[in-house]
Amino acid sequence: APVRSLNCTLRDSQQKSLVMSGPYELKALHLQGQDMEQQVVFSMSFVQGEESNDKIPVALGLKEKNLYLSCVLKDDKPTLQLESVDPKNYPKKKMEKRFVFNKIEINNKLEFESAQFPNWYISTSQAENMPVFLGGTKGGQDITDFTMQFVSS
């Protein structure tokens, strides 16, 4: 069955935008004015996931690119990456678990918990121009809260 999807940008709670840093990495930095056009546009899709109150399973693709955020083990550590997919087969309702994030939405703030690695979240650093990563702590130095902005076509 088809599912709903939307186009959006994400900013962390310090208002840092997400931009491409090389072909397979995102970084977070403050943007202003025309530079805002650099920020990544996500295609966020509802997907099938495990049931849990106030968690909504989504996949985060890069709009009009065959790239999805995914969570894998690298050197025994949960790691966030951009993964190429076959555009003929994606997006789909039953995404592989590494592509699934549990969206937690409270007071217009969003968190994205890895379905593959519970309690690991899409995170940014306090510092400018650093990679977006998968972090295993919430409420510490690293930022796990985001806001979403619909993209007008």
Partner: antibody, heavy 119, light 107 residues
Framework: EVQLVESGGGNVQPGGSLRLSCTAS????????MAWVRQAPGKGLEWVGI???????YYASWAKGRFTISRDNSKNTVYLQMNSLRAEDTATYYC?????????????WGQGTLVTVSS | EIVMTQSPSTLSASVGDRVTITCQAS??????LSWYQQKPGKAPKLLIY???TLASGVPSRFSGSGSGTEFTLTISSLQPDDFATYYC??????????FGQGTKLTV
Amino acid sequence: EVQLVESGGGNVQPGGSLRLSCTASGFSLSNSAMAWVRQAPGKGLEWVGIIYDSASTYYASWAKGRFTISRDNSKNTVYLQMNSLRAEDTATYYCARERAIFSGDFALWGQGTLVTVSS
Amino acid sequence: EIVMTQSPSTLSASVGDRVTITCQASQSISSWLSWYQQKPGKAPKLLIYKASTLASGVPSRFSGSGSGTEFTLTISSLQPDDFATYYCQNAGGGVSIAFGQGTKLTV
């Protein structure tokens, strides 16, 4: 106070068109998913459609082609454009905000606006 | 498209009664099921989402259960304010959203 107010309802002849508005106060509509739901007199609730960004709209099968949802974030307003109206479109039309993106449930509703299609 | 079927269509009960309304989905919707209460001339009010989670401000006498295709709404002890029409609705991010036909709860 957080609320939604619908307007634009009224009498229209079969085959005519009408545009309903839903204006938010107390919050910004710009990043809210907004749906329209209708209710014919004495009948049950019927989902019309939902809008996320302006390119991401979804409709009930019966509404596709005749009904269009759009938004104007600068006016904090969502619209329902209804064309080729029929007697069976007579209903109270509600706008509602999705509780969370893709939750598919609606925690905030307007008071509704009545559309009557009759010659 | 998913079809939601409620039973009964009408239900007579008294203050203090325990009442149960059932909702059946034509295909599995996991736990993506919501319940609403509507009073005459008013907009619907969200009672329960994700099959069993109470919406903000809803009294604890309301409860929901079920998953897959079979769901129930229970009011443990009816209060005068509870006489209304109740609707189930499949939720989540599927393209199609549908409401049940409603259950009118009368004195």
